[in-house]
Amino acid sequence: EPPTACREKQYLINSQCCSLCQPGQKLVSDCTEFTETECLPCGESEFLDTWNRETHCHQHKYCDPNLGLRVQQKGTSETDTICTCEEGWHCTSEACESCVLHRSCSPGFGVKQIATGVSDTICEPCPVGFFSNVSSAFEKCHPWTSCETKDLVVQQAGTNKTDVVCGPQDRLR
């Protein structure tokens, strides 16, 4: 009876189990009753990083110098190229497809440490009593206004993104 499932590193085709191609190789032809799966190594600047039945290898990523990218680790037949940014610049994502001078901290967060040539901006959430209402790469969280020192009272509570709103004290008639 033909199999309905195959072992690890195999695949089911034409009611039989064929071996997958190993990383770094692509499928040329499926196995038959009489022949093994035929695989070929990926070409220069190509890769496949899993056991596979792909008929085409993937192109290595291009680290575009016009976007500030350079090669951090050269690709092999089994691994993709890893890009990083020029000195002083930082990847916009884990995939590092473009470079930014430094990231900013969103409202509700303040800058704990300004970016340097080697480290990106470090943000921290504004604690109770502090706020930030801007996106910034240098501004810390600011303390809420002290209404009491202005002889006023809090009319609207502050948040991590907004200052308190002060107003006049109610006068007794």
């Epitope: 940014c85 020029e86 610049w89 473009s98 790469a137």
Partner: nanobody, 116 residues
């Protein structure tokens, strides 16, 4: 399209002064934090100074504190950097930047050379 055009660089003797300008277009100038950054020959990028959208808060790198002053004129869409007591180590190409400053957003910059 965002455009930032730096000017005002040149050759100056140690101890001298220069005022850099950055004319901006293609975005709402008054809504953005702006930076001056510089790149010395063969070195990485250094963050020099920053200013908030209203011009009320500023940042200076330790290396320029007390010598450089950043300012902006939102009515003219222009950012400035007044550089006094210039030193040889201030020699660099100076760029202005808005957040987020992508690598391919860079203008041509303006070259400041401090030499006797």
């Amino acid at each position: 399209e965002v455009q930032l055009l730096e000017s005002g660089g040149g050759l100056v003797q140690p101890g001298g002064s220069l005022r850099l300008s950055c004319a901006a277009s293609g975005f709402t100038f008054a809504g953005y934090e702006l930076w001056w950054v510089r790149q010395a020959p063969g070195k990485g990028l250094e963050r020099v100074s920053a200013i908030n959208p209203q011009g009320t808060r500023t940042y200076y790198a330790d290396s320029v504190m007390g010598r450089f002053t950043i300012s902006r004129d939102n009515s003219k869409n222009t950012l400035y950097l007044q550089m006094n007591s210039l030193r040889a180590e201030d020699t660099a190409v100076y760029y202005c930047a808005k957040l987020p400053f992508m690598f391919d957003d860079r203008g041509q910059g303006t070259l400041v050379t401090v030499s006797s």
